[in-house]
């Protein structure tokens, strides 16, 4: 059976996996794969270590801890809903059927939608033909629809307000405190 871990779209997911090296530097190969652990090896390998190094990895997948100390926990960067599913961490201990296998179920939740700041809402109400979208992650955008009846002063003020609200939202997403 698999153990469940959760992350939110746009966050990094952390899938813990550890082993104790028999002696310092006496490392064993480890593989991470997408899908439950098969009888041997890992299916759909996303990362692999050998007795010395991380010798295979794919983009967005990395080891956060020090694998030389037995910390082979996997980090998946900037997750999407497609990253949901079961992951296999396999500690490839020498000998017949000695491998330690961990099936970890990653559940990705949609990102929390934060209501836009009041000032931005006021401007949206004042200029109903303006469309504002609040995205998540690197592809986040804010888009203006056509604004034929707004003069240059209003557009300038509006741009400043949008910039300020974007900055506030970005700070909030980073966990910073807005004073």
């Amino acid at each position: 059976s698999e153990v469940e871990y959760r992350a939110e779209v746009g966050q990094n997911a952390y899938l813990p996996c550890f082993y104790t090296p028999a002696a310092p530097g006496n490392l064993v190969p480890v593989c991470w794969g997408k899908g439950a652990c098969p009888v041997f090896e890992c299916g759909n390998v996303v990362l692999r270590t050998d007795e010395r190094d991380v010798n295979y990895w794919t983009s967005r997948y990395w080891l956060n801890g020090d694998f030389r100390k037995g910390d082979v926990s996997l980090t998946i960067e900037n997750v999407t809903l497609a990253d949901s599913g079961i992951y296999c961490c396999r500690i490839q201990i020498p000998g017949i059927m000695n491998d330690e296998k961990f099936n970890l179920k990653l559940v990705i939740k949609p990102a929390k939608v934060t209501p836009a700041p009041t000032r931005q809402r006021d401007f949206t109400a004042a200029f109903p033909r303006m469309l504002t979208t609040r995205g998540h992650g690197p592809a986040e955008t804010q888009t203006l629809g056509s604004l034929p009846d707004i003069n240059l002063t209003q557009i300038s003020t509006l741009a400043n307000e949008l910039r300020d609200s974007r900055l506030a939202n970005d700070l909030r997403d980073s966990g910073a405190t807005i004073r």
Epitope: Y14, P16, T20, P21, K69, G70
Partner: antibody, heavy 117, light 107 residues
Framework: EVQLQQSGAELVRPGASVKLSCTAS????????MHWVKQRTEQGLEWIGR????????KYAPKFQGKATLTADTSSNTASLQLSGLTSEDTAVYYC??????????WGQGTTLTVSS | DIQMNQSPSSLSASLGDTITITCHAS??????LSWYQQKPGNIPKLLIY???NLHTGVPSRFSGSGSVTGFTLTISSLQPEDIATYYC?????????FGGGTQLEIK
């Protein structure tokens, strides 16, 4: 034989700083994470933080961020804990321990820190 | 932070008894749980790691079980030298956290 030898008891004034040391024998500290744990009299164990002496990566418990500073010197095989802005709340026994990698398999004998005017 | 709730906080038992201490994690920690014994005036000593693995030199009357959020430490055939405080600890997420401890005394 694996051993962690900690520095002796300290009596310090409020507001001062102190540096506690932990010297390892029987293993090389760069091969392990080195941790510090606090225990107040008749109370439980509190994890302060850990250092990876191989690359000086340090993690602190939020409560001890700004209070504790962890360092390691691989040439002398010693890990150290500096505590600043001391108050009576810092009076405790401080243990160093090594981990393999997520549990503490060897502990130092502890250093008693007393903060008093 | 992951909270570790340990119960009972104190326990009185007779020599030869079997006792059980439980530890509950506030979120999933898989099997990344350890148990320690601290005798009065002494340093903590590792008993069990990875929820159920006995550390070298620990008597077989100690055993651990559980996974995800619920864990137990069992001491069978209680001996006088088992008088101590027992702590659980999760090692999955930083900050590492300990249970509040269970003080075991002999009746």
């Amino acid at each position: 034989e694996v051993q962690l030898q900690q520095s002796g008891a300290e009596l310090v004034r409020p507001g001062a700083s102190v540096k506690l040391s932990c010297t390892a024998s029987g293993f090389n500290i760069k091969d392990y994470y080195m941790h510090w744990v606090k225990q107040r009299t008749e109370q439980g164990l509190e994890w302060i933080g850990r250092i990876d002496p191989d690359n000086d990566e340090i993690k602190y418990a939020p409560k001890f961020q700004g209070k504790a500073t962890l360092t390691a010197d691989t040439s002398s095989n010693t890990a150290s804990l500096q505590l600043s802005g001391l108050t009576s709340e810092d009076t405790a026994v401080y243990y160093c321990a090594r981990s393999s990698p997520y549990y503490f398999d060897y502990w130092g004998q502890g250093t008693t820190l007393t903060v008093s005017s | 932070d992951i909270q570790m709730n340990q119960s009972p906080s104190s326990l009185s038992a007779s020599l030869g008894d079997t006792i059980t201490i439980t530890c509950h994690a506030s979120q999933n920690i898989n099997v990344w749980l350890s148990w320690y014994q601290q005798k009065p005036g002494n340093i903590p000593k590792l008993l069990i790691y990875k929820a159920s693995n006995l550390h070298t030199g620990v008597p077989s009357r100690f055993s651990g079980s559980g996974s995800v959020t619920g864990f137990t430490l069992t001491i069978s055939s209680l001996q006088p030298e088992d008088i101590a405080t027992y702590y659980c600890q999760q090692g999955q997420n930083i900050p590492y956290t300990f249970g509040g401890g269970t003080q075991l005394e002999i009746k």
